[in-house]
């Protein structure tokens, strides 16, 4: 049986338009092969009327089009100005007419009861505006103008020139009479509802000499665009509703049962708790278009989404809308990574961020999701050597371990660091992941002095105490800079006495700076790692001052005078302009994630079982 699907029977009336959607499996071959609409002949052939390669038969010239939507696995044939001659048997298909995959469609066009030959058909999208034009003759110029809707057998008055408005149309309809030169009046209906569809009659005058015009109004609900994304990945909904709603509140909602649509996010500041930390509504353009990015996709995110505009910030009858059907592919190419990482005040975390391994040269970014208003994700660090000023000395993005994963290390943690962070690149926008950092009770595992002052020309030794739990880890000292942390030689001084209940496996590893120069001033980290996987780190700021008295300096833990929550950043540190990610592909001078390709998965991207994978700060 053919895998192509469409409607078997299509019925319409003369003058109308039809939109026939044919579905095909969206394989790579099918997406790119020829699509066609042909009419079956009596002897079995099928004459092409229109195809995706640009051919249009003379019978269809100016009244038909075929549009392929490869990402959805659909193509749509629109045929306008139908006549009874269009009745017949057709095929929609892929490939070659005689041998391709196809589906049989029967089209029947009738005159239709109650539709007069002069009926004008108006086909308008839900929530939009229609203008019904009604001509009249000079003798009726001064007479009452009216519009009726046919309800069952009876015409019901909708609006007239004496000021009457049917309650169903209050606040969204007007009757305009053109200037004296034009024998025409118009009825404009805004915020069209599905219930507005039907047959209308406009009339000038009330006697036997009145002028009448029939109209058939079709209100179309948007066909949902099919979107397939990977579990743990991200999706972007681009919503373009038109400039007429540029100043109206926008929303994205998810349909639950029937016509209910629960707000996911809107421009009035509402956000569904399930999307905390992993959603951004990007500011709208002047034309009213906007986009919503959701990261850390879960199985339960699958469903039908609508974006729209309404002053209430939620779906109401008459809201212009766009629709998507989101499918979440559980056979994801995006590897599982912890969605929660825990650290202690004064301690550190090392976050592993996945990226598309085919894009190893892409720029990597890490941003902090902020929930205020519509959500934003200001950039904190990138792989090109930029670090936000407030994070200097305590944040580093490392390309290691590579091959599809990079590492972000954040130390000197405070309670203010708790929150949702996004990993992203300027490449594949689907590979945006979110991690939540939680600050828990406890003490940092690595012990270093707080502030250290070195003297020009002298030797400085800075200790770092590693508990026995890190006995099997590689221990290192490095000097932090914007591009990473450059390893420095260090000395193992034997077991540490800084830990109670810790045996000979604890370690004191010192950093020695000989003949200190001004260039030695800065941040130094001690840390642990296993191969290319980083664990905990601790940071020390070394200040350099003029010689006061001779001798070398050996710093002990007792001199650690900075509280965990204190920032020991020197006011002289240069400020890098505030950078926040706009779509990392579009960065202009601002690094702010806009389309942002930035979404953060907040609430824990659930991983299969539904329980979040957690990662402690003390090991990878």
């Amino acid at each position: 049986k053919s895998p192509i699907f469409g409607p078997e029977e299509v019925n319409s009336v003369e003058g109308n338009s039809v939109s026939i959607t044919c579905y095909y499996p969206p394989t790579s071959v099918n997406r790119h092969t020829r699509k066609y609409w042909c009419r079956q002949g009596a002897r079995g052939g099928c004459i092409t009327l229109i195809s995706s390669e640009g051919y249009v038969s003379s019978k269809y010239a100016g009244r038909a089009n075929l549009t392929n939507f490869p990402e959805n696995g659909t193509f749509v044939v629109n045929i306008a100005q139908l006549s009874q001659d269009d009745s017949g048997r057709y095929k929609c298909g892929l490939g070659i007419n005689s041998r391709g995959l196809s589906f049989d469609v029967s089209l029947e066009v009738s005159q239709g009861p109650g539709l007069l030959n002069d009926t004008k058909v108006y086909t308008v999208d839900l929530g939009r505006t229609v203008t019904i034009n009604c001509p009249f003759k000079t003798e009726n110029a001064q007479k009452r103008k009216s519009l009726y809707k046919q309800i069952g057998l009876y015409p019901v008055l909708v609006i007239d020139s004496s000021g009457y408005v049917n309650p169903n149309y209050t606040g969204r309809i007007r009757l305009d009479i053109q200037g004296t030169g034009q024998l025409l009046f118009s009825v404009v209906i805004n915020q069209l509802r599905l219930s507005d569809a039907g047959q209308y009659l406009c009339q000038a005058g009330d006697d036997s000499n009145s002028n009448k015009k029939n109209a058939d109004l079709q209100v179309l609900k948007p066909e949902p665009e099919l979107v397939y994304e990977d579990l743990r990945g991200s999706v972007t909904f681009h919503c373009a509703l038109g400039p007429e709603v540029a100043n109206v509140a926008k929303f994205l909602c998810r349909q639950s049962s029937g016509e209910n649509c629960d707000v996911v996010v809107n421009t009035l500041g509402k956000r569904a708790p399930a999307f905390e930390g992993r959603i951004l509504l990007n500011p709208q353009d002047k034309d009213g278009s906007f986009s919503v990015v959701i990261t850390g996709l879960r199985k339960e995110d699958a469903g039908r989404y609508l974006c729209g505009a309404h002053s209430d910030g939620q779906l109401q009858e008459g809201s212009p809308i766009q629709a998507w059907q989101l499918f979440v592919n559980e056979e994801s190419t995006i590897p599982r990574s912890p969605t929660v990482v825990k650290g202690v005040a004064g301690g550190s975390v090392a976050v592993l961020c996945p990226y598309n391994r085919k894009e190893s040269k892409s720029i990597k970014y890490w941003c902090l999701w902020e929930g205020a208003q519509n959500g934003r994700c200001p950039l904190l660090v990138d792989s090109e050597g930029w670090v936000k000023a407030q994070y200097e000395g305590r944040l580093s993005l490392l390309e290691e371990p590579g091959n599809g994963t990079f590492t972000v290390i954040l130390n000197q943690l405070t309670s203010r660091d708790a929150g949702f962070y996004w990993c992203l690149t300027n490449g594949d926008t689907l590979w945006r992941t979110t991690v939540e950092i939680k600050i828990i009770e406890g003490e940092p595992n690595l012990k270093v002095p707080g502030n250290v002052t070195a003297v020009l020309g002298e030797t400085l030794k800075v200790p770092c105490h590693f508990p026995c739990k890190f006995s099997s880890y590689e221990k290192y000292w490095c000097k932090w800079n914007n591009t990473g942390c450059q390893a420095l030689p260090s000395q193992d001084e034997g077991p540490s006495k800084a830990f109670v209940n810790c045996d000979e496996n604890s370690r004191l590893v010192s950093l020695t700076l000989n003949l200190v120069t001004r260039a030695d001033e800065g941040w130094y980290w001690c840390g642990v790692k296993q191969g290319h996987f980083y664990g905990e780190t601790a940071a020390v700021y070394v200040a350099v001052e003029e010689r006061k008295a001779a001798g070398s300096r050996d710093v002990s833990l007792a001199k650690a005078d900075a509280a965990p929550d204190e920032k020991v950043l020197d006011s002289g540190f240069r400020e890098i302009e505030n950078k926040a990610i706009q779509d990392p592909r579009l960065f202009a001078e601002e690094k702010a994630v806009a389309d942002t390709r930035d979404q953060a998965d907040g609430s824990r991207a659930s991983v299969d079982s539904g329980s979040s994978e957690e990662q402690g700060g003390s090991s990878r």
């Epitope: 699907f5 299509v10 939109s19 959607t21 579905y23 058939d216 948007p222 349909q255 029937g258 039908r304």
Partner: nanobody
Amino acid sequence: EVQLVESGGGSVQAGGSLRLSCAASGITISNNCMGWFRQAPGKEREGVALLYSTSSTSSQKSHADSVKGRFTISRDNAKNTVYLQMNSLKPEDSAMYYCAAKSGVCRWNWEYGMDYWDWGKGTLVTISS
């Protein structure tokens, strides 16, 4: 909340006819996909007919191969009701018949996820030979 109420089921002899009705509330039958499905004891639910109408004068429909030429789906937009006219009934048509509604256009694929539909409680059709 979508509510679909089926009626018109019953027992008839093979070769007879029945007309099922489905009164919908909470969803307009135009501009949405309406369908009839059936489930015989011990069998999986299967599609019978689908209908998508954009106006009082335009509609698109499909019928399952097993009922083609015998069953016809139709609608009355004013009453927000969908019908299934069943002629030349056979014993194998015996089943519980369900009316279903899905937001938006029909996908025309009988295997298309049934979890996207809202369902009525069903009406029983029994055909004796």
